[in-house]
């Protein structure tokens, strides 16, 4: 077993058999509780200054006779650097100076080893290296400056804030780090406890109006505040916080201000402030009209800015009806504290005068718009309707009309530029432009800066102008063995007017073609017609081509018709009636053509 | 740094003996256990035994017992390995190496012993 | 005495790969938490280099692709990744009691 002499010991071990034993600086005196007194426990003094290295204690085996052939080898916490070994005689050393706040306590293992086969002679011990502390550490404050707010008028006695200051040494062990709190700037304002640090209003009546920033200076100083004690030092910036404790004043008791009539809804007119010594939402401020001739056409709105009243216009003025108006207004704070509400009512109010004055104004059109009607077979010089403007102004200035021609530049339209009545130039054709909008525009005689333009809505009426025609071009076939009355074809029309009932088509072969054809036209009398065979077979080497000239007419006023041709192939076909040849025989007989009569 | 010199070859006649050497320079002689170790090309490495300089304690593997005697001369911290009785079974390499905590930590570069008549 | 089986008796291994050795003691070379097992390499015409020494400790200067492992009586020694200078003879050797013994050797070869 590794041990020591009992007589080398600071106070003896208990007297239990160890592997391996250990003597030195274990003051054991210092934590002699029976229960947590530990037999491998060393203590060193922290930040040792001596010239050696400093001595910890020995470790020992009863297996070593002392020549040489065990060694003793040190691990863990700092072995081999902050503590050293000698290998031969177990003596421990540290070679550091040891600061307890950087590390209290170095766990270190032990072991002592045959040097000839590297045999642990016994099993390895643990053992505790724990600083003893000195007072070597100020109290540091957990911040350097700490800022705190408390409203403005706050009781004595009113809790601010906590500052704390820690300090590194040892609490477990004398005063060292033990902190007391005392105020060296800020009195009489603040007061802190001594033991917790907690500062507190000391004051009454501290009036944020009058004074706002505080700088209040915190010593906290250890071993309980006692002579020769270390401390440190904090600044605490302490702002009062503003209560609602003054109402709004106007600095004048009238304000007067003037708007054109021409003023539209929402515009402002101008402002008016009250003042508030307080700050924030104690210092803002509702504004409202409370009474006067203009309660309905003006309004009070509240910039969050600036906390100015915005007078602005709520209908729309005339000066021919109301030159001046007369407001009450109003400012309040909307946050009030019941407890200041003895100083006074938290509002006041000022009258405010508006004049209205007079604008030349552009002529007023009868309508907003105007939607006017024309047949497209209307002559030149059709008129198509009027319109009407007229000067607002009580001098009632003439008015003369014009087209805006950026918005009819083909010149199709024109006005009379006295009565405003409107009239075609050119032609028109529904079928181009079914709707043209223009603009008219209205100046006063007197004064041509003042114009107003209205929108002109000018539809194009339908006349039956165009002819229906094919939808598609036709060419079809019919197959040699085909039999009589059989459908080759469907036929469709199509027409570019657009009638009031809707297109009704009729199809039919022409005259010249009706007798003896070879095909029938069938008008199905729902705008198609159907191609039929008129007889039993065909022969493509007799005749391979047909041409069929079918009239097709519409049923408005005036009729229109045309006549479209409709190519008719004869084909040798299969017995499913799937073509199979329709044109090599067709270079053979170059004269077979016929119009199908 | 730490060397272990020995001579290179021995050749010897059967029923000899033979002294071989072993010189250390470069750490304290006395500190460190001085081993032995025979090598064959068929029987790999055998350790035959140690000494320890500063007592001249000794061991032996019990085989070598009788064969080999180990000894050191402090003054010129050299080691010595006599073998006795030499048969041709004694013809190996034999290298000297410093021992530390059960481990061969620096070796010399080996004597070559031949015996051969 | 305690005698040490290596195996296998050579193996050829890759370049990169890894390379394991065993060895088993007849009975057990640890006390006290401190396992006796040392690791040699030998290359021809050479005498033998300490690599490991008590079952997992690198001697000072030996690259870190070496290491070694185990308790009691098996313990195994790994290389990776192998490199060409690895070519030798590897043994493993005890102190745990008179006679110290070695391992019978593990020749490696590099493929």
């Known amino acids: 077993t590794l041990s020591t002499p009992l007589s080398k010991r600071t106070s003896g071990f208990p007297a239990k058999k160890r592997a391996l034993e250990l003597s030195g600086n274990s003051k054991n005196e210092l934590s002699r509780s029976k229960r947590s007194w530990m037999w491998n426990q060393f203590f060193l003094l922290e930040e040792y200054t001596g010239s050696d290295y400093q001595y910890v204690g020995k470790l020992h085996s009863d297996q070593d006779r002392g020549d040489g052939s065990l060694k003793y080898i040190l691990s863990g916490d700092g072995a081999g650097d902050l503590f050293i070994i000698n290998e031969n005689t177990g003596d421990i050393q540290a070679t550091k100076r040891l600061d307890r706040e950087e590390k209290p306590v170095y766990i270190l293992r032990a072991q002592a080893i045959n040097r000839r086969t590297g045999r642990p002679v016994e099993p390895e011990s643990e053992f505790i290296i724990k600083i003893h502390d000195i007072n070597d550490n100020e109290p540091i404050f957990t911040k350097e400056v700490y800022t705190a707010t408390v409203p403005e008028m706050s009781d004595v006695g009113t809790f601010v804030v906590q500052v704390t200051a820690t300090d590194a040494d040892d609490p477990t062990y004398g005063n060292s780090a033990k902190v007391v709190y005392s105020i060296l700037q800020g009195q009489p304002y603040f007061s802190v406890e001594s033991e917790t640090g907690i500062i507190k209003t000391a004051l009454l009546n501290m009036d944020r109006e009058n004074r706002e920033q505080y700088q209040v200076v915190i010593q906290a100083k250890d071993m309980g505040g006692q002579m020769g004690g270390l401390s440190g030092t904090t600044t605490v910036n302490i702002t009062l916080t503003d209560v609602n404790d003054n109402p709004p004043r106007f600095p004048q008791s009238t304000y007067q201000f003037k708007t054109p009539e021409s003023s539209p809804p929402g515009t402002p007119i101008g402002r008016i402030k009250a003042s508030d010594a307080d700050v924030g939402e104690n210092a803002e401020i509702e504004y409202s009209i409370t009474d006067g001739e203009g309660l309905d056409m003006f309004d009070v709105i509240t910039d969050q800015e600036t906390q100015e009243g915005i007078i602005t216009v709520k209908k729309l003025l005339d000066f021919e009806k109301k030159k001046v108006y007369t407001l009450k207004v109003e400012a309040s704070n909307p946050h009030v504290e019941p407890r200041f509400l003895y100083l006074g009512p938290f509002k006041d109010s000022a009258t405010v005068r508006i004049v209205v004055e007079d604008v030349d104004e552009p002529p007023v059109f009868s309508k907003l718009a105007y939607i006017l009607q024309i047949r497209e077979d209307a002559q030149i010089n059709t008129t198509i309707g009027s319109v009407t403007a007229q000067d607002p102004d009580a001098a009632r200035n003439p008015v003369k009309y014009s087209v805006d021609r950026h918005t009819d530049m083909d010149r199709i339209f024109n006005i009379d530029s006295g009565n405003g009545s409107i009239f075609t130039s050119k032609l028109l054709d529904r079928e181009t432009l079914l709707w043209h909008n223009i603009t008219v525009i209205a100046t006063e005689i007197n004064n041509p800066k003042q114009s107003s333009r209205v929108p002109l809505y000018i539809k194009v009426l339908d006349v039956n102008d165009n002819a229906p025609e094919f939808a598609e071009f036709y060419e079809t076939f019919v197959c040699e063995k085909a039999k009589a009355d059989q459908l080759i074809q469907t036929l469709r029309a199509v027409d570019k007017d657009d009638p009031y009932s809707g297109h009704q088509f009729s199809f039919s072969l022409a005259p010249e073609a009706a007798s003896g054809s070879n095909f029938t036209i069938q008008d199905n009398k729902d705008n198609t017609a159907g191609i039929l065979t008129r007889k039993n077979g065909y022969n493509r080497h007799e005749m391979s081509t047909y041409l069929l000239p079918v009239v097709i007419s519409d049923n408005d006023y005036p009729v229109q018709s045309s006549t479209g041709t409709v190519t008719v192939r004869v084909c040798a076909c299969d017995h499913h009636g799937n073509m199979q040849s329709c044109h090599a025989e067709a270079l053979i007989h170059p004269t077979g053509l016929s119009t199908g009569a | 740094q730490v060397q272990l010199q020995q001579p290179g070859a021995e050749l010897v006649r059967p029923g000899s003996s033979v002294k071989l050497s072993c010189k250390a320079s470069g750490y304290t002689f006395t500190n460190y256990w001085m081993h032995w170790v025979k090598q064959r090309p068929i029987e790999g490495l055998e350790w035959i035994g140690d000494i320890d300089p500063s007592h001249s304690e000794t061991h032996y593997t019990q085989k070598f017992k009788d064969k080999a005697t180990l000894t050191v001369d402090k003054s010129s911290s050299t080691a010595y390995m006599q073998l006795s009785s030499l048969t041709s079974e004694d013809s190996a390499v034999y290298y000297c190496?410093?021992?530390?905590?059960?481990?061969?930590?620096?070796w010399g570069q080996g004597t070559t012993l031949t015996v051969s008549s | 005495d305690i005698v040490l089986t290596q195996s296998p008796a050579s193996l050829a291994v890759s370049l990169g790969q890894r390379a394991t050795i065993s060895c088993r003691a007849s009975e057990s070379v640890s006390i006290h938490g401190t396992h006796l097992m040392h690791w040699y390499q030998q290359k021809s015409g050479q005498p033998p280099k300490l690599l490991i020494y008590a079952a997992s400790n690198l001697e000072s200067g030996v690259p870190a692709r070496f290491s070694g492992s185990g308790s009691e009586t098996d313990f195994t020694f790994n290389i990776h990744p192998v490199e060409e200078e690895d070519a030798a003879t590897y043994f493993c050797?005890?102190?745990?009691?008179?006679?110290?013994?070695f391992g019978g050797g593990t020749k490696l070869e590099i493929k």
């Open positions: 050797q005890q102190s745990f009691e008179d006679p110290w013994t």
């Open positions: 190496a410093r021992g530390d905590l059960g481990r061969f930590d620096y």
